[in-house]
């Protein structure tokens, strides 16, 4: 069964910068990836970026840069303009659509123990949440 992993990291150098990494584990080629925050897109979440493998990417503030890392994984850099760092408690969701197989979605947030001053950025450990 295909799965989606989501990892959220705070940048060690800039506390106001976050990066969301998402990947698709399964067969099929990806047609579209949608990244949202505050919940899944369509269920109260707000769309941050849409990535298409051929037609490019579209992103909305506070997304700074959305890009493909591999054919089945993406990263989204976010710039937190506020001093209170609201991203720390936010859920980020990634939905991967593959034709004709369908869509798979998972959500994740910054691990509560994250302290960018103590260590290098963490290894991408899948944070899985079955079929939302």
């Amino acid at each position: 069964t295909p799965e989606v992993w989501v990892q959220v990291q705070m940048e060690a150098t800039e506390l106001s910068s976050f990066t969301v990494h998402c990947g698709f584990l399964g067969p099929g080629s990806i047609s579209l990836v949608t990244v949202s925050w505050g919940g899944p897109d369509g269920a109260g979440g707000t769309k941050l970026a849409v990535l298409h493998p051929e037609l490019g990417t579209r992103q909305w503030a506070p997304a700074r840069q959305a890009r493909w890392e591999t054919q089945s994984s993406i990263s989204l850099a976010l710039e937190d303009s506020g001093a209170s760092s609201p991203f720390a408690n936010t859920t980020f969701c990634c939905k991967f659509a593959s034709f004709p197989e369908g869509s798979w979605e998972s959500c994740g947030s910054l691990p509560p123990s994250s302290d960018p001053g103590l260590s290098a950025p963490p290894t991408p450990v899948p944070i899985l949440r079955a079929d939302l």
């Epitope: 099929g28 047609s31 849409v50 034709f99 004709p100 369908g102 869509s103 939302l132």
Partner: antibody, heavy 120, light 107 residues
Amino acid sequence: DVKLVESGGGLVKLGGSLKLSCAASGFTFSSYHMSWVRQTPEKRLELVAAINSNVISTYYLDTVKGRFTISRDNAKNTLYLQMSSLKSEDTALYYCARHEDYYGFAMDYWGQGTSVTVSS
Amino acid sequence: SIVMTQTPKFLLVSAGDRVTITCKASQSVTNDVAWYQQKPGQSPKLLMYYVSNHYTGVPDRFIGSGYGTDFTFTISTVQAEDLAVYFCQQAYRSPWTFGGGTKLEIK
């Protein structure tokens, strides 16, 4: 202007074969996923077969697996459905449809349909 | 496969009425739902995608809502040209499946 024009339908005997074609124009055919959808005499819609843009993946309705083959010729901008061992329940109006990635794979363009009647 | 149960099968309404069609999925399909309109003698036409987004040129009297398993399609003020059969469809998981259709007739 996007156009999808189906052809190849007709009256065929039980167990017979037919090949449907769908000529596409007005868009970059090779960039879109395509499907064959049929509408039964009872007006139900069924997605019969689908093929992705890069011809890596296909899908078939369980009841047509092993009997129908979907294919595409991106150089000729044409979608095909080879149907064999036809059954009476294959009688329907067959539409070719285009899927739009940005619309959640919704079918944004449909052809006018070609009728297939399987008789005993 | 995911079953899309659409109700009612028939609707007899007057011009100006508000009508609602419901579609229930047998499992969550998130927001991957489209609605189509099929007028007599024509092929289906896309009205809404991602539940609530209007396809190009579709009037805003057509309204879609829902998430997960329960979806509604509303025509806020029915007009004579809305005489058609309406279908919901899920594109969340293969095989894409359609509702049974709702035939809208105008008094």
